[in-house]
Interface confidence: medium
């Protein structure tokens, strides 16, 4: 059997095996998916789901995979300027971005900001930020576009037109995108160009009251959705969101933590144990949450998981 779909070397695939008694499918995991991030070793899992007798297509996933956030971070705010936003709501988005930038002003973060609606406008790029690290001044001429919500196009615009060395992006930096929107996309397409960007999405307001509407945001965010998609019912709650982001992007207060002292999924060893029943896979993550351990509930396609 030829296994495709992973850029990582797997040494221990099959160390964990589980079969589904209902249809004979097999889950094979390697809990030793190892890589280095700023001198820290990350350890998570790599799992494959095979049909009975190893026939037909197989699924591959990386449960508990923690993205590497290196010392230098280039962060783009991609913020909604559609007509459904009231000026006070739009102002709260600007205030949130300013707050993040002010709190991270003495770190290895660089910022850029893009407003999107029907079209896209770079309000300031990384070079502008380096020249003048004053968020109030950088955002004082933002003109609310008041048109549609072309999210697919906007993400592609950021990937191709903002993360550019000639505009101040650093080749060694981790690319992070924070998308802030109050509505579902009015365009369609794919975001393949942004695959190497860590993507958070914040959906705010009355248009995200249903589970279906919330799930429309998942395709724009990195996985797992539980980590990278945030739904807020009011714009006021943006004020409290920074603390949560700070926990997620753990190097947020300095240049680079060379020696991690607390862990979420960095050393999860997910896939150390597994259960498969009626097509539903659960894997053990012994090193999660400072080695408190726990289980990861895998989605059917193995592309997402919940702790």
């Amino acid at each position: 059997v030829t296994l495709r779909g992973s850029n990582y070397t797997s040494k221990y695939l099959g160390m964990t095996l589980a079969t589904d008694p209902t249809d004979g499918s097999i889950l094979a995991c390697d809990p030793g998916l190892s890589r280095t991030c700023d001198q820290n070793t990350y350890l998570s899992g790599l799992c494959y789901l095979f049909r009975q007798n190893l026939q037909g297509p197989m699924l591959q996933g990386r449960p508990g995979f923690q993205e590497c956030i290196k010392g230098n971070v280039d962060l783009v705010f991609l913020f909604d300027g559609s007509m459904s936003l009231q000026p006070d709501e739009f102002q709260k988005i600007l205030d949130f971005m300013k707050d993040v930038m002010k709190k991270l002003s003495n770190t290895s973060y660089q910022f850029a900001a893009v407003q999107f609606s029907t079209s896209y406008k770079t309000e300031f790029d990384f070079s502008d930020y380096v020249k003048r690290k004053d968020p109030d001044a950088l955002l004082k001429h933002v003109k609310h576009m008041l048109l549609l919500t072309n999210t697919f196009g906007a993400i592609n615009y950021v990937a191709t037109e903002v993360f550019r060395e000639e505009l101040g992006a650093r080749p060694d930096a981790t690319k992070v995108l924070i998308i802030i929107t109050d509505g579902e996309a009015t365009d369609s397409g794919n975001i393949d160009a942004a695959k190497d960007i860590i993507r958070y999405i914040i959906g705010i307001g009355k248009h995200f009251q249903t589970k279906e509407s919330q799930e429309t945001l998942h395709k724009f965010a990195s996985k797992p959705a539980s980590e990278f998609v945030k739904i807020l019912d009011t714009f006021e709650k943006l004020k409290d969101l920074f603390t949560e982001l700070q926990k997620k992007i753990y190097v947020i207060e300095g240049t680079s933590k060379q020696d991690l002292t607390s862990f979420n999924m960095e050393l999860s060893s997910s896939g150390i144990s597994a259960d498969l029943s009626r097509g539903h896979a659960v894997v053990g993550a012994v090193g999660a949450k400072d080695w408190a351990g726990g289980f990861l509930d895998l989605k059917a396609d193995l592309q997402d998981d919940t702790f």
Epitope: D95, D136, A137, H141, V142
Partner: antibody, heavy 121, light 107 residues
């Protein structure tokens, strides 16, 4: 609570320079344009201009370009308007007002009480 | 500059009545008109912006309509505290300009 505090009255002699003040509180002073508006006795409102406290960028109504100079002091969250060579024509109520920069221009969501300037010999 | 003509200059009405104040711009200003209330001893209050959007905290008896050059502020079922001076302001282009004002008096 957003507040813009202005002195109630100023009395000046013609020709003497006058500097009107507006102290802001209850919001991020450097995050909003500060505007100045004039109201002469028995007349309507006239927009003088606006300043952004973050970097003191100023936009003035051409009508007031030789009359008004706008400044800010970030440390005290205060905005100032200096009127050059005041005459009795400059006697008016002067308001400061916080601007909401919307679709490229501005309307005002909070106003000061206004300073009544009397220029008289 | 955009000139704004506001009418009427004076308006007398009784509590419970519905009144309308008009503003006409010398050229099209799209929908970008704001309305303010001025009362002695109080700071000016923003009522409406963008022609028809009610500022938060303003009672729903205030409403705005119009686009292009002609705009209307309507106050339905007048309350005693509504008797005041009203101004419109265009926020479509610089320099920002105001209407001449309407004094709403108790009949």
């Amino acid at each position: 609570e957003v507040q813009l505090q202005q002195p109630g009255a100023e009395l000046m002699r013609p020709g003497a320079s006058v500097k009107l003040s507006c102290k802001a509180s209850g919001y991020s002073f450097t995050g909003h344009w500060m505007n100045w508006v004039r109201q002469r006795p028995g007349q309507g409102l006239e927009w003088i201009g606006m300043i952004h406290p973050s970097d003191s960028e100023t936009r003035l109504n051409q009508k007031f370009k030789d009359k008004a100079t706008l400044t800010v002091d970030k440390s005290s969250s205060s905005a100032y308007m200096q009127l050059s060579s005041p005459t009795s024509e400059d006697s008016a109520v002067y308001y400061c007002a916080r601007g909401i920069y919307f679709y490229g221009t501005t309307y005002f969501d909070y106003w000061g009480q206004g300073t009544t300037l009397t220029v008289s010999s | 500059d955009v000139q704004i003509t506001q009418s009427p200059s004076y308006l007398a009405a009784s509590p419970g009545e519905t009144i309308s104040i008009n503003c006409r711009a010398s050229k099209t200003i799209s929908k970008y008109l704001a309305w303010y209330q001025e009362k002695p001893g109080k700071t000016n209050k923003l009522l409406i912006y963008s022609g028809s959007t009610l500022q938060s905290g303003i009672p729903s008896r205030f409403s705005g309509s119009g686009s292009g050059t002609d705009f209307t502020l309507t106050i339905s079922s007048l309350e005693p505290e509504d008797f005041a001076m009203y101004y419109c302001q265009q926020h479509n282009e610089y320099p920002l300009t105001f209407g001449t004002g309407t004094k709403l008096e108790l009949k």
